[in-house]
């Protein structure tokens, strides 16, 4: 017998899809080897149609796809718009030719079958309602008018012109005509139910002069669509319920033993395991909504059901829709721990990563509140100025190419720990989460920075110096500007007669900024930190303030400008080459963006890496010929 | 919640056929698949066949001990599932139990299935 296993015998009708799932045995060969599906001919040879190795014969070409689920032992074949041509036996396997481990499985395909002429069919969604059309001669006018269900012995009352109404109809059935048409009466049964399915009989008058009409009752139950995604990628459910439920409370549930668990719903309710991970979204006044899931777990998969009721919970007569979603090992987003720890007063460098075939994408950083529906508010982008509750303190630096960018948060406060998401106006299913867990601190930073209270005077020399331990001996340290644009590293070269230089003191560990002479540009926020090649890692912050000699302490105010400033970091020089780029207003970056809001994510995060630079440059640009300082130890 | 009767099991002479039903009542439109195991004494729950449905496409799963000998079918006005069983062998003997599943990842492992009915007997003799 093969250890492959499906199912034996598939049957469909023409136009419909099916979705074969053929199960392997665990094994680490079997999981990466060739899959195929082929269809065997009279000779005993199996034509291959689809192939793991992205074969797909004519035939199949834009209908059909097979997908490796290597964390189940399974795979997937998904085969569309089926006609009667695709009746057969075909054999599902593993293998590098046809001949390897299979299984056999016939397909059957019929013609959609026909009713008899005098029975009307209406077919409609669980939840929704229908309107039964019931024609009758003139003379029946006014005779008693009826819809009966039939069971196997007789035809069960459901409602009559006399106002009787079978119990289990209360509430969901009226008998109406409109206006002055004497020949139809209607019958409207609402929030159907399995239950109501069936035969049918409306009838006007009694004996052999009755008008009576068949009516075959379907009430469907949705099909599921089955959606694909990767790990660590993110799922929006798109959740189209009809106006009819408009002003209902909206939820999204996961199928479970017994029940359907609710997730979310526009009630508040939230279940904790997708707590920072989640976004309930109302689309518009006709039943619309939207559920978004950023950082797909492997227990994420299952069968989801979304639906619309008062209570906000699953009720039976309510319309609904339904997916399975599958969730896909072989991620090609990168793994990332998904929890970022920072400490009071320190910093935190986060790598977002993104599609890197999208580089020239905008990218964005939002924080996750869970008030209401759940929203992300933008704090930082490419092209979006730092939100200004975060100044001086949070940039953004976008590392062209590699498939990260880097944000980095320093002056943490326990305010600060929460979720964020990274996310871009590209490739959504790179929209990530990470948690900020923020401790208090217990020593002191790694980074200092002397004097503290920085004040400048205009005119003059001013030396700030940035302390740090041995352990960043051989880590990149520099000194950059910060503006609400992001942070710009200061440029390694003279600009004329304005002297300003940073030095390296080994024995004391330290890295020195001079400005010389101090202008009122140079006020503002300063950025100390270190970083190995494009991993950045902690930072500090200082605002130097600029007053004129005779001055009392200067405002705090910051300015966009960049300081003029030299940076000589050990026996090397930082060459500071910066693209320029304009700064435009944030452009709508998602279905859900509501101004600075975007309402879209992923899970992902680095643990524990302070932060650095951030700067995303978008502001003036320099580049620099390196020069070789002297350095005073 | 989803109900599940069987009915049809009975003593038969080897070569026989029987006809096994399991009537599914509740909510029953969450269901996506219905099946068949049996348990003989001092053996394990083992699995013969099931069925899951996806609108109008049926997928059929047979164990080798009774492809060819055992169909299973669905009424779906009646939330019915069949197991008409023909040339039935000694080796058949067994309490037969309905299984119904909201979401079904292997249809041969029976914690994939979320409901149970009591069980049916079927003997054969030879």
């Known amino acids: 017998k093969s250890p492959i296993f499906g199912p034996q015998e598939v049957s469909s009708i023409e136009g419909d899809s099916v979705s074969i799932t053929c199960y392997y045995p665990d094994t680490s060969v079997n999981r990466h080897t060739r899959k195929y599906w082929c269809r065997q001919g009279a000779s005993g040879m199996c034509t291959t149609l689809i192939s793991s190795n992205g074969y797909l014969s004519k035939e199949y070409s834009g209908r059909a796809n097979l997908i490796n689920f290597p964390e189940n032992n399974t795979f997937v074949i998904n085969i569309e718009q089926l006609t009667q041509d695709d009746t057969g036996s075909y054999k599902c396997g593993l293998g590098t030719s046809n001949r390897g481990l299979s299984f056999d499985v016939s397909l059957e395909v019929s013609q959609v079958p026909e009713l008899p002429s005098d029975t009307h069919v209406y077919t409609k969604d669980i939840g929704r309602n229908v309107t039964i059309e019931c024609p009758f001669k003139r003379e029946n006018a006014p005779s008693k008018k009826s819809l009966c269900k039939k069971t196997n012995q007789s035809c069960e009352l459901v409602i009559d012109s006399t106002e009787k109404v079978n119990p289990s109809y209360i509430g969901r059935a009226k008998l109406f005509m409109k206006g002055t048409d004497l020949t139809v009466f209607y019958v409207n049964i609402s929030h159907l139910t399995h239950n109501d399915a069936g035969l049918y009989i409306c009838q006007a008058g009694e004996g052999p002069s009755a008008d009576k009409k068949n009516v075959d009752l379907q009430v469907l139950a949705p099909e599921p669509e089955l959606l694909y995604k990767d790990l660590r990628s993110s799922v929006t459910f798109e959740c189209d319920l009809g106006r009819e439920v408009a002003n209902e409370a909206k939820y999204l549930c996961r199928m479970n033993k017994e029940t359907c668990d609710v997730i979310i719903n526009t009630l508040g309710k939230r279940d904790p395991d997708f707590e920072g991970r989640i976004l309930i979204t109302p689309k518009d006044d006709n039943g619309r909504f939207s559920v978004l899931i950023t950082g797909l777990r492997k227990e994420d998969a299952g069968h989801y059901q979304c639906g619309a009721h008062s209570s906000g919970l699953p009720q039976e007569g309510w319309p609904i829709q339904t997916w399975q979603l599958f969730v896909n090992e072989e991620s090609t987003i990168p793994n990332r721990r998904s929890v970022v720890k920072g400490v009071t007063g320190g910093s935190v460098a986060i790598a977002c990563p993104y599609n890197p075939k999208e580089s020239s994408s905008l990218k964005y950083w939002c924080r996750w509140e869970g008030d209401g529906n759940g929203h992300c508010p933008v704090l930082v982008g490419t092209q979006a100025q730092v939100q200004e509750e975060y100044e001086g303190r949070l940039a953004l630096f976008d590392q062209p190419g590699n498939g990260t960018y880097t944000v980095i948060l320093n002056q943490l406060t326990t305010e600060d720990a929460g979720f964020y998401w990274c996310l871009t106006n590209g490739d959504s299913r790179w929209r990530t989460t990470i948690e900020l867990q923020v401790a208090e601190a217990t020593r002191e930073p790694n980074l200092e920075v002397t004097p503290q209270n920085a004040t400048a005077v205009l005119g003059e020399t001013f030396t700030v110096s940035c302390h740090y331990p041995c352990k960043f001996y051989s880590q990149e340290k520099y000194w950059c500007k910060w503006s609400n644009k992001g942070c710009h590293i200061l440029p390694s070269h003279d600009e004329g007669a304005r002297q300003s230089s940073v030095s390296c003191d080994q024995s004391s560990q330290l890295v020195s900024m001079t400005l010389n002479p101090v202008s009122k540009e140079d006020e503002g926020w300063y950025w100390c930190g270190v970083k190995q090649g494009q991993t950045y890692g902690e930072t500090t912050a200082i605002y130097i303030a600029v007053e004129e000699r005779t001055r009392g302490s200067s405002h705090v105010n910051p300015t966009d400008a960049n300081a003029r400033a030299k940076v000589a970091l050990e026996e090397e020089v930082v060459d500071s080459s910066i693209s320029e780029k304009e700064n435009k207003a944030i452009p709508n970056p998602g279905p859900f963006a509501n101004e600075r809001e975007i309402q879209n994510v992923g899970d992902q995060a680095q643990e524990n890496r302070a932060s650095g630079d951030a700067g995303s440059a978008d502001g003036q640009s320099r580049s620099s010929s390196s020069k070789h300082h002297h350095h005073h130890h | 919640q989803v109900q599940l009767v069987e009915s049809g099991g009975g003593l038969v002479q080897a070569g026989d056929s029987l006809r096994l039903s399991c009537a599914a009542s509740g909510r029953t439109f969450t269901t996506y698949g219905m099946g068949w195991f049996r348990q003989a004494p001092g053996k394990e729950r083992e699995f013969v066949t099931t069925?899951?449905?996806?609108?109008?496409?049926?997928?059929?799963y047979y164990a080798d001990s009774v492809k060819g000998r055992f169909t299973i079918s669905r009424d779906n006005a009646k939330n019915t599932v069949y197991l008409q069983m023909n040339s039935l062998k000694p080796d058949d003997t067994a309490v037969y139990y309905c299984?119904?599943?909201?979401?079904?990842?292997?249809?041969?492992?029976?914690?994939?299935?979320?409901?149970w009915g009591q069980g049916t007997q079927v003997t054969v003799s030879s």
């Open positions: 299984a119904a599943s909201t979401v079904l990842r292997d249809p041969r492992v029976p914690t994939e299935y979320d409901y």
């Open positions: 069925i899951t449905w996806s609108g109008s496409t049926n997928y059929k």
